[in-house]
């Protein structure tokens, strides 16, 4: 106890009132109004609560404190008077600050400040929103992801910043007086083939196909090592060449001389080279057969094997490179007679006349071609005099129904040695190459050396066998007259074609040999 | 008739790039390739590579490779070089020539000098 | 690469003379060329494919051989001839020339 009269006890927040009594400060309570233990204690009283009667008047906040409160201008208001606190509803001059005025980059990039009482927001521009995470921060709205799907299928979505575009897709272009860019925009598909935007190789045939387009092969070509066919970028190679090579066991310098020269020509072969490649192949031809060389010394079955090569091989190398060639009429010459006639058109509907200076063809355009084949139609012939060296005494091989006719009434008539060639050996060509059945026949006119009397002449093809030989055979091939130096035959299939004379005597009009016509 | 005509001459700084023309007139341009041919002063004919107008192809000596860029522009019927990283020894006459493999090469152009000087 | 070897380097020879140099390749070739360049002027085709002379060639020139062995021949020299003769192979890439053949005037 205190001398003086005090207590010395008094909890913390009061004061005493004589030496067995405390009072709480202004600002706290106790239980009671008097405190007369030390147990008791004096709370903060909270005028701010509701039910209190401090009123600090609006667009301000009561703040309790320790044993007392202040009033302050709530967030987004601000005192005319300067006073950051004040006690009471007089006191109060709270009005609202325009934050927009104050800081002009409130709302950051594409977004417009807005005043509110106490308060701003941000209004973003046409294209962007609000950011959930940052409300004062716009950001561009993808229209393009945000499921308004707002372009049409033809088109794709390009969003940029604020805005988005729909723009034809690769390989489209705008309908015919459709933007391209805004949400209107209607797009078809681009032929890149008839306009000439493809990249395909010379090499390749341009196919379009939905939104792009591709390259394959041409026919007759393969795409080369490593790269795959239908690609933009496939380039192809030309296989005439690769395939017409030497012939298996026949060993001859002059023939090796020849594949080398073919194989050179198709190294570094190109389409545009197509004509300049023909006369080239023509030529070593030529040479070949008027300077046979060795080949003269191989055995005549091998001679054989050798000209059933040449003769299959320049059927389909022609053939291929003349797909090659533009659209007319191509005659060439060499010095040994080998002679090519050549004709090169879009499909017509007439029939065609190929003219030499030993022979002549006449055929139906319409055989030319194989349907869906969107390459030109090509009808050729070649006259190959020379290959008459290596044909000499090759076999003819008749029919079995006809030879049996001919042993029953000509027994012995046939032993007389190998048929004489009387003709150039002439090959016929299509741009088709499925020429074994001719919807309408091929005529052909030869001329000839002068037939020897009571001897009977015979339209012949070159027949190729398994063994990769061959034989003259009638099968398919009719005379439909002969004079002294010219015969004329029709055939159904196109191949390799000659005019042989029999070595046996011809009967007045006897029946059994217009049979084997 | 065939003619191969070449640019003028060029005087070029060590480390340049020239670009020589060779303007084909008179056949089907794609019928043939372009050739390139150097002849050093006093030197024989090396091939330098050929392109083919039809498709762009190239094709190139190993030595020239990265060296001489061949192009052709089919619409004014015009084969270019390029010859880059130029040193003295690039000094030459360089020639066009259409070729064919079976008919080498039968039209030559003029030849074109180029000089390599600092 | 296909080499080809020209020999002899330079000869000489007079007006009426026969002329022969050869082209050796070091592998086989098919297509042989021979072209006849002048002192500043651009090299002209003289003999394509072996033997066949090119357009306005004088048939005095001519050209044989086979695999790696080619001959071009001056069956009578005219002044007009002295100039240096290349041979070139379009057998195998890349394209070479030989070095050259230079005929001068004895």
């Known amino acids: 106890q205190d001398s003086r009269g005090c207590a010395r006890w008094c909890p913390q927040d009061s004061s005493c009132v004589n030496a067995t009594a405390c009072r709480c400060n202004p600002g706290f309570s106790s239980f009671s109004e008097i405190i007369t233990t030390p147990m008791e204690t004096c709370d903060d009283i909270n005028e701010c609560a509701t039910l209190s009667k401090v009123s600090c008047g609006k667009f301000s906040d009561c703040w309790n404190t320790e044993g007392s409160y202040d009033c302050v201008c709530s967030p987004g208001y601000e005192p005319v008077s300067g006073a950051k606190t004040f006690k009471n509803e007089s006191e109060n001059t709270c009005q609202d600050v325009d934050e927009c005025q104050q800081n002009p980059r409130l709302c950051k990039s594409y977004g417009t400040c807005v005043n509110t009482l106490g308060s701003y927001t941000c209004q973003c521009l046409p294209g962007f929103k609000l950011k959930p995470e940052d409300p004062k921060l716009c950001t561009d709205v993808n229209e393009c992801t945000s499921g308004q799907n707002p372009c049409h299928s033809s088109t794709h979505c390009l969003n940029n910043v604020g805005s988005y575009q729909c723009r034809c897709r690769p390989g489209w272009q705008p309908i015919p007086g459709s933007p391209n860019g805004p949400n209107n925009t209607v797009c078809e598909d681009v032929d890149e083939c008839s306009s000439g935007q493809h990249q395909c190789d010379s090499s390749t045939v341009c196919f379009n196909t939905v939104g792009s387009y591709s390259c394959r092969c041409r026919p007759g070509w393969k795409p080369r090592h490593g790269i795959p066919n239908n690609q933009k970028d496939t380039v192809c190679e030309d296989m005439t060449f690769s395939t017409w090579t030497p012939p298996p066991g026949v060993h001859s310098q002059t023939l090796s001389r020849f594949f080398d020269k073919v194989q050179d020509l198709g190294r570094d072969y190109k389409p545009g080279l197509a004509n300049n490649t023909i006369q080239s192949i023509l030529q070593a031809l030529d040479e070949l057969l008027e300077a046979p060389g060795d080949l003269e010394t191989l055995p005549r079955l091998q001679q054989h094997c050798v000209a059933s090569h040449l003769l299959d091989g320049l059927e389909d190398v022609l053939r291929g490179l003349s797909k090659n060639l533009s659209n007319g009429l191509l005659n060439f010459s060499y010095p040994a007679g080998t002679e090519l006639s050549l004709e090169v058109q879009k499909q017509v509907d007439r029939s065609v006349t190929l003219r030499q200076n030993q022979a002549v063809m006449q055929l139906d355009w319409n055989q030319a071609q194989k349907s869906g084949d969107p390459g030109p139609s090509v009808v050729g012939l070649v006259s190959i005099p020379g290959m008459g060296k290596l044909l000499a005494e090759a076999p003819l091989v008749l029919e079995p129904e006809k030879q049996m006719l001919l042993h029953e009434t000509h027994q012995g008539l046939l032993q007389d040695g190998s048929p004489i060639l009387l003709s150039d050996v002439i090959s016929a060509f299509l741009s088709n190459n499925d020429t074994q059945n001719l919807s309408s026949p091929v005529t052909f006119t030869f001329s000839h050396r002068s037939v020897i009397p009571r001897q009977k002449v015979l339209c012949v093809f070159w027949e190729h066998g398994q063994n990769g030989c061959g034989h003259w055979a009638t099968t398919g091939c009719s005379t439909i007259g002969t004079r002294d130096t010219s015969t004329i035959c029709r055939c159904t299939h196109l191949s390799s074609f000659a005019v042989l004379m029999a070595h046996y005597d011809v009967q007045e009009e006897d029946p059994v040999l217009t049979v084997i016509t | 008739q065939v003619q191969l005509q070449q640019s003028g001459a060029e005087v070029a700084k060590p480390g340049a790039s020239v670009k020589l023309s060779c303007k084909a007139s008179?056949?089907?341009?794609?019928?043939?390739?372009m050739q390139w041919i150097k002849q050093a002063p006093g030197q024989g004919l090396e091939w330098i590579g050929a392109?083919?107008?039809?498709?762009?192809?190239?094709r190139h000596t190993q030595k020239f490779k990265g060296k001489a860029t061949l192009t052709a522009d089919k619409s004014t019927s015009t084969a270019y070089m390029e010859v880059s990283s130029l040193r003295s020894e690039d000094t030459a006459v360089y020639y066009c020539?259409?070729?064919?493999?079976?008919?080498?090469?039968?039209?030559w152009g003029q030849g074109t000098t180029v000089t390599v000087s600092s | 690469e296909i080499v080809l070897t020209q020999s002899p380097a330079t000869m000489s020879a007079s007006p009426g003379e026969r002329v022969t140099m050869s082209c050796s390749a070091s592998?086989?070739?098919?297509?042989m060329h021979w072209y006849q360049q002048k002192s500043g002027q651009s090299p002209k085709r003289w003999i394509y494919?072996?033997?066949k002379l090119a357009s306005g060639v004088p048939a005095r020139f001519s050209g044989s051989g086979s695999g790696t062995d080619y001959t071009f021949t001056i069956s009578s020299m005219e002044p007009e001839d002295f100039a240096t003769y290349y041979c070139?192979?379009?057998?195998?890439?890349?394209?070479?020339f030989g070095g050259g053949t230079k005929l001068e005037i004895k």
């Open positions: 020539a259409r070729g064919f493999t079976a008919y080498g090469m039968d039209y």
């Open positions: 008179g056949y089907t341009f794609t019928n043939y390739w």
């Open positions: 392109v083919y107008p039809g498709d762009g192809d190239t």
């Open positions: 592998s086989s070739v098919s297509y």
């Open positions: 494919d072996t033997s």
């Open positions: 070139q192979q379009w057998s195998s890439n890349p394209l070479t």
